[in-house]
């Protein structure tokens, strides 16, 4: 065994940046650091066969399989994949190790399988086997976390039944409103499943895996806060767990909290209380109402009452199926070139939606913000004043929703012209859609004031580019204007733009760009 070469097999992951690299190049794209694949001699095999850890790759990922050989002298090599021989160019690194690489670009099913590398060195011949398969991400899921009470303890467990198993974290905040944004210094994150500190202002649990991140907020009624103008509403699907926390602070311990559903006290086993003294010696009590698996008859007004605070309620609505409620009628907007403007969609949905904004086949991240009235809003401001069609798409486990917007930017026309043997055409994308005039320039009319009305054909909205309308006007050539300069002008309420064309022979001849008023 002593005279066998020391073999190191590594996997290099590439961040795809659409570079087109040949199959067996040694220097591909932007790379992650190499991962050791634990190459070892295959037990009980005839001949010297090394085997690398099996590799599982996402569809479309790009990787390099690489072998580093610590053996004296030169080496020659050959890759074999599905009975086909592939070229192999070894080179030497700074430690004088032989380096052989196989680049797999944008992994597909056809590139999965066994890659055999045959190496011949001065001392010995050996084979290295790589097994590459495609990761089955169809099985991946990411489910919204939910809460359970920990057995025999006043603590909550956060559970997310997801594949691969997610990292679960509690996101806690003790201040009000905006300062509880995710990256605010007031926010504390705890990467654990069990939470004992349940007195905070805002408590969320988040789960994340390869598919992203999902969060669930602990629904809270704070008796020391002024009630919202509209009754807070909580939606749940049949079978889901219900958790509502009622919180109250008082100068001393002489107060109690109770939960009622539709004026009937909750049954024993559907609530538990915790209390603590805060730093200023006031007493904080919290009372949880919970149902491990809700049914339709758990719908109703849940009221938290205190002997020292005004009571507050929340409406719990149990639905069979998730929903997205919003108006889906399309909306058209026209704005000035430098006007600040955002699209917005107001919706009510359960479970929480995943959404995207799309323009010109490009998707943009979608943020949603909860409003006090139980509605949520998503705004899109990143349109960069590009006119066209914008699409908002939202979905959750049970429903889908799409809404179209058209954005028109008020600006004066800009004219492009082209000419052929038989006609001249002008195009403009100004908004409002422009009107057209054609003028002939001659000795009689050096300023091109002689209007042409014969043979003019206007087409409004001749083509739609991602919702952007283009207007055109075509002038059919007649003997009367052949050989002359003609001028097409597009005008709207914001101004006029003209282009001059020489009508003499075939081919596109825009001649001069005229003054634009």
């Amino acid at each position: 065994n002593q005279d066998l070469p020391v073999i190191k097999c590594v996997l290099i992951n590439h961040k795809n940046n659409d570079s087109s690299v040949g199959k067996s190049s040694s220097y591909p794209m932007v790379s992650e650091s190499p991962e050791d694949l634990g190459c070892a001699l295959r037990p009980q095999s005839s001949g010297t066969v090394y085997e690398a850890a099996a590799v599982e790759v996402d569809v479309s990922a790009s990787i390099t399989l690489q072998v580093l050989v610590d053996a004296p002298g030169n080496i020659s090599c050959l890759w074999v994949f599905k009975h086909s021989s592939l070229n192999c160019q070894p080179h030497f690194d700074l430690q004088n190790r032989g380096v052989v690489s196989m680049v797999i670009l944008k992994m597909t099913e056809t590139q999965a399988g066994e890659y055999l590398l045959f190496i011949q060195s001065e001392a010995t011949n050996y084979t290295i086997l790589f097994t590459v398969s495609i990761r089955n991400t169809l099985l991946y899921t990411l489910r919204r976390p939910y809460f359970r009470k920990m057995e025999n303890q006043d603590a909550l467990v956060c559970i997310s039944e997801s594949v691969p198993e997610p990292i679960v974290e509690w996101v806690l905040c003790d201040s009000q409103g905006e300062s509880c944004k995710e990256e605010s210094p007031a926010v504390v994150k705890k990467e654990e499943k069990v939470l004992h500190e349940l007195f905070g202002t805002d408590i969320r649990c988040c789960a994340r895996n390869e598919l992203g991140r999902e969060c669930t907020r602990l629904f809270t009624i704070d008796l020391n806060q002024t009630p919202q103008t509209t009754l807070p509403q909580l939606f749940l699907k049949v079978g889901e767990p219900l958790w509502i926390r009622c919180k109250a602070v008082h100068v001393n311990h002489g107060f109690g909290l109770t939960w009622e559903l539709e004026n009937k006290a909750l049954e024993e086993g559907n609530y538990f209380e915790m209390s603590t003294y805060s730093t200023n010696r006031t007493m904080i009590r919290i009372l949880f109402a919970f149902v491990s698996s809700v049914a339709r008859n758990d719908t109703g007004y849940y009221t938290c009452s205190s002997s020292k605070h005004p009571s507050q309620s929340a409406l719990v609505t149990i639905v069979e199926k998730g929903f997205i409620n919003a108006t889906n009628s399309s909306e058209d907007y026209e704005i000035d070139q430098y006007e600040e403007f955002c699209f917005s969609v107001r919706f009510k949905a359960y479970p929480q939606i995943r959404c995207t904004w799309t323009f010109s086949r490009k998707s943009f991240p979608c943020e949603q913000k909860g409003l006090d009235n139980g509605y949520s809003i998503s705004k899109f401001c990143n349109h960069k004043h590009q006119p066209g069609e914008y699409i908002f798409h939202a979905e959750n486990d049970d429903a889908q929703f799409t809404k179209m917007f058209t954005l028109n930017i008020r600006r004066k026309p800009q004219v492009l012209a082209e000419a052929s043997a038989s006609q001249a055409s002008c195009f403009s994308d100004g908004y409002p859609l422009p009107s057209w005039t054609w003028k002939k320039c001659s000795d009689k009319s050096p300023n091109c004031t002689e209007e042409i009305t014969e043979g003019v054909w206007n087409r409004k909205a001749n083509r739609k580019v991602f919702g952007q309308w283009v207007s055109s006007s075509t002038l059919n050539m007649s003997e009367a204007i052949k050989g002359f300069l003609v001028k097409c002008c597009a005008y709207n309420s914001l101004g006029t733009s003209c282009e001059t064309i020489l009508l003499n022979s075939p081919g596109p001849f825009p001649f001069i760009q005229d003054n634009i008023s």
């Epitope: 996997l11 991962e35 694949l37 634990g38 850890a53 099996a54 599982e56 086997l129 691969p164």
Partner: antibody, heavy 124, light 107 residues
Framework: QVTLKESGPALVKPTETLTLTCTLS??????????VSWIRQPPGKCLEWLAH???????SYSTSLKSRLTISKDTSKSQVVLTMTNMDPEDTATYYC????????????????WGQGILVTVSS | DIQMTQSPSSLSASVGDRVTITCRAS??????LAWYQQKPGKAPKRLIY???SLQSGVPSRFSGSGSGTEFTLTISSLQPEDFATYYC?????????FGCGTKVEIK
């Protein structure tokens, strides 16, 4: 260069929960078929396998300690975490993490690399 | 659970000696066995995997043999750096189990 490094408290009190982290470098539990195990060794005693977690997130636990152990991984941080509840002085040991490699033809790459170990003492 | 019984639990030998350590499984484990060497205060180091395959970088004086229930680690000519404790591990079925070690001491 493959390395595994254990971190966590050197001292825990009886009934408390122990959380140990194994930080990996030079390999990952992302694309290659690999697993990371936790193994412990009480002073002057035998090695005892506790648990392992595979790159596809499957887990296996020691039968006798199953109810007390939880193993998890965070691929983005290259970490494997072991928690052990209700610690007892009997759990005083050096805790190691080690790598397992799964080959195309089977899992025979058990514990080819080990961390240096962390001595955890359980005492009030 | 599969029990792994290692023998002897300790032995004294001199440099140059041939040393044999045995590991017996309570049921058949094919060749799903590895051997490890551990020195005081250090983590174990793998010597042999799949019962008889030598770990890369391990001197060829170490060899492994056996299949089923009886396995042997042999050091053909003991060197000063070989004084340590040796463990076998079965990875045929859960839970994975180690033998309780054989301590090789200087005579």
């Amino acid at each position: 260069q493959v390395t595994l490094k254990e971190s966590g408290p050197a001292l825990v009190k009886p009934t408390e929960t122990l959380t140990l982290t194994c930080t990996l470098s030079g390999f990952s539990l992302n694309n290659a078929r690999m697993a990371v195990s936790w193994i412990r060794q009480p002073p002057g005693k035998c090695l005892e396998w506790l648990a392992h977690i595979f790159s596809n997130d499957e887990k296996s636990y020691s039968t006798s300690l199953k109810s007390r152990l939880t193993i998890s991984k965070d691929t983005s941080k290259s970490q494997v975490v072991l928690t052990m509840t209700n610690m007892d002085p009997e759990d005083t040991a050096t805790y190691y993490c080690a790598r397992i490699v799964g080959y195309g033809t089977g899992w025979y790459g058990f514990f080819d690399y080990w961390g240096q170990g962390i001595l955890v003492t359980v005492s009030s | 659970d599969i029990q792994m019984t290692q023998s002897p639990s300790s032995l004294s030998a001199s440099v140059g000696d041939r040393v044999t350590i045995t590991c017996r499984a309570s049921q058949g484990i094919r060749n799903d066995l590895a051997w490890y060497q551990q020195k005081p205060g250090k983590a174990p180091k793998r010597l042999i995997y799949a019962a008889s395959s030598l770990q890369s970088g391990v001197p060829s004086r170490f060899s492994g043999s056996g299949s089923g229930t009886e396995f042997t680690l042999t050091i053909s000519s003991l060197q000063p750096e070989d004084f340590a404790t040796y463990y076998c591990l079965q990875h045929n079925s859960y839970p994975l189990t180690f033998g309780c070690g054989t301590k090789v001491e200087i005579k």
